[in-house]
Every structure is written in C-alpha cells, then in structure tokens.
Amino acid sequence: GLNDIFEAQKIEWHEGGGGSDYKDDDDKGSSHHHHHHSSGLVPRGSHMYDFTNCDFQKIEADYLRTISKDLITYMSGTKSTDFNNTVSCSNRPHCLTEIQSLTFNPTPRCASLAKEMFARKTKATLALWCPGYSETQINATQAMKKARKSKVTTNKCLEQVSQLLGLWRRFIRTLLKKQ
C-alpha cells in the first residue's frame, strides 16, 4: 500500500535534514527569500494560482516514482545533516505553493533550479494534475527561455533543494494522514 511505498522512499535524504517536525516561524536568514502562502495560492503576475483542486494522488505518484530520485541525485555527495529545514507547509495546497515557489522563483544566490530535471518534472506534474495550471505558465515559459542556462550547483542551491525535499516529504505525510 501507500505506506509501504513511502517507507521504501525513506533513503538518506528523506530521513535527514531537520527531522520530522517543521518550524512554522519565518525563514531566518536562509538563502531563499520568498513569502509563505499558507492559503495554497501562488502569485502569478496579477493573479494567484490555487492548488486546492489538484489531483494530489497523481502528483504523489509522480513524485515517488521519479521526481524524488532526481532531487536525491542532485543532492548526491552531501549529508542529510548538512542543512536545516527552515521552510514548512501545513496542508497539501500549501505544500505545493511552497514547492512551486522554491523550484521556480529564481533567487540572487540560486538562479538555476528551473532548468534541472526535477524542476522540469515538477512543472509537468503540476501542469497535468492541477486544473488550469498550464495556462498560468504560458507567459512564465517565455521568461524562463530567456533565463541563463547556468548549470553551476552552488551550496545555496543545495540548501534550497534540501528544503524542497523536506516540503515534498511533508506533502506525502499530509497525504498519508488522509488515507
């Protein structure tokens, strides 16, 4: 069942990096400066995307089958204790809001994540299983094409991806509680 799949996924990066409890306080001096959107809404130009109606089961399946492996590959060579989880999420839509923000919003110290394989797969799964999400990405895609094709993995990017692993883990946990 779902629990077995989840347990099988608990390799190093899923177990480490801040433990099972998440701080709900503000981001204290981490590399990524973004706002928390606990409502599950993503700012997209002049409007917000609401992740409430996504097919969470399908997204979870895509994550467990392939996205998680790409995230872990990206983190290879680092230890799960190297970074602390400073970003949290409280429910499934909120988790997707934070995942979207950390994956696709460039920051001064980590601007290249959107070109990574895990990011492309994350974009695809959101576009497929979140009604109307693809429409919000049409203009965003033009901007991304103009972005630099930098492939340098900085320590700050590793820290950001460790936060992503924590958010995805939390997303899975909120799903498991619903089973």
């Epitope: 089958r65 695809a124 429409e135 895609t141």
Partner: antibody
Framework: QVQLVQSGPEVKKPGSSVKVSCKAS????????MHWVRQRPGQDLEWMGT????????DYNQNFKGRATITADKSTSTAYMELSSLRSEDTAVYYC?????????????WGQGTLVTVSS | EIVLTQSPGTLSLSPGERATLSCRAS??????VHWYQQKPGEAPRLLIY???QSISGIPDRFSGSGSGTDFTLTISRLESEDFAVYYC?????????FGRGTKVEIK
C-alpha cells in the same frame, strides 16, 4: 521539422486487439506527452488518453479504461496505443498528437491518422 | 467531465464574410480552450491556443477570445480554404474533451 508518422490501416475481427504506432521525429520526445484521439466515421473527436514519457505515466478516458493501453519506447521515440476487445463501434481513425508538458501545453502536431476497421 | 457545446452546428457563409463560432463550457475553465480546423481526410490543425494565443503560420484572420465558460473563434474574412469543420477543446482538466464541431460551408 516535427513529424508524427503513424502505422498503416488495420482490419480486425470483433473481440481481437489492435496496436497502432506513432513514430516521432524533429523534437525532443520526452518534452512532450503523446495523446491519442479517435474519430468515428462522420463523428466528432474523442480523447482516449495520453502517455507522458518525462514522468513515465499515463492517463485514460474512463470510456476506454481497461481496454486501451498507451505506452512509449523512448529509445525509438515511438508511442503505441493498443485497444483490446474490439467491437464494430471501434471502427474509427485513430490519431496521435503531441502536447508540451513543460511549455506550450497544447496538441500542436498530429499524426496522419490510422484507420482501424472492425468487421466480422 | 467538462462538456463543450459548439454553436451553430453549421454556418453557411460566402467568401469574404465574417464567421463567428461559439464554444460554451459546462463549467469554468479559465482560458484553457484551443481551436482546431479539420478538413475531410485530414488530421486536425491547431489554430488558436489558450483562448486567444496565436500560432505562427496561421493567418491573422483567425482570432480567439473569451474566458470562463464562453469562447469565440472569429474568422474576419473567409477565404475558400477556410471552409471546414472547427472544433474547440479544453485542457483545463482530464479527461480532455472536444466540442461536437461547427461546419463552415459555402453558401
């Protein structure tokens, strides 16, 4: 340029299966989902399902669930649609169509269609 | 599933005239509607995506508008090659669905 080339026409008996292929070229295969759409004689278009190579996953129209299987061979950039337990109402032209999954998000290129005739 | 209702079923017009085709969705689908043209014996061809986005290579006499539940495809001045069947399609959510088509025929 982008091309989707489908396999040739098929004549099948009721109760049998058919497997239609769609060979893609001119683009990165994994950047696009492959959808299958059918059109019965004189009828409108009906979405059957899709395979997403990037995520190794598929999704189906409930009307075809259990009878349709959509797969892909990434090494040859070829998608397949197999329909089992054929009946006369399955006589139709079957189209493959690509759709971007990280950009464009629309069926912007179509195969030429494969006519499948189900007759005893 | 989302049902798309196209009207009229048939539109009889002369070359040079303006054609207005309608597509109504059974629920709110934002702007996730695409328009295709199909001629006998051919595969559908994409004309407009996400309600109003134009496609390179498609003549600019084709334009789209609408959002929510009501969408329109307009052909400003019909050319002889425009007489065909036009379908709207939604990609808002699975299962993807098509309208039943509007046939634009020569009067």
């Amino acid at each position: 340029q982008v091309q989707l080339v489908q396999s040739g026409p098929e004549v099948k008996k009721p109760g049998s299966s058919v497997k239609v292929s769609c060979k893609a070229s001119g683009y990165i295969f994994t950047d696009y989902a492959m959808h299958w759409v059918r059109q019965r004689p004189g009828q409108d278009l009906e979405w059957m399902g899709t395979f997403i190579p990037l995520l190794d996953t598929s999704d189906y129209n409930q009307n075809f669930k259990g009878r349709a299987t959509i797969t892909a061979d990434k090494s040859t950039s070829t998608a397949y649609m197999e329909l089992s337990s054929l009946r006369s109402e399955d006589t139709a032209v079957y189209y493959c169509a690509r759709m971007g999954v990280t950009h464009s998000y629309v069926m912007d290129a179509w195969g030429q269609g494969t006519l499948v005739t189900v007759s005893s | 599933e989302i049902v798309l209702t196209q009207s009229p079923g048939t539109l009889s017009l002369s070359p040079g005239e303006r054609a207005t085709l309608s597509c109504r969705a059974s629920q709110h689908i934002s702007r996730s509607v695409h328009w295709y043209q199909q001629k006998p014996g051919e595969a559908p061809r994409l004309l407009i995506y996400f309600a109003s986005q134009s496609i390179s290579g498609i003549p600019d006499r084709f334009s789209g508008s609408g959002s929510g539940t009501d969408f329109t495809l307009t052909i400003s001045r019909l050319e002889s090659e425009d007489f065909a069947v036009y379908y709207c399609q939604q990609s808002y959510s699975f299962p993807y669905t098509f309208g039943r088509g509007t046939k634009v025929e020569i009067k």
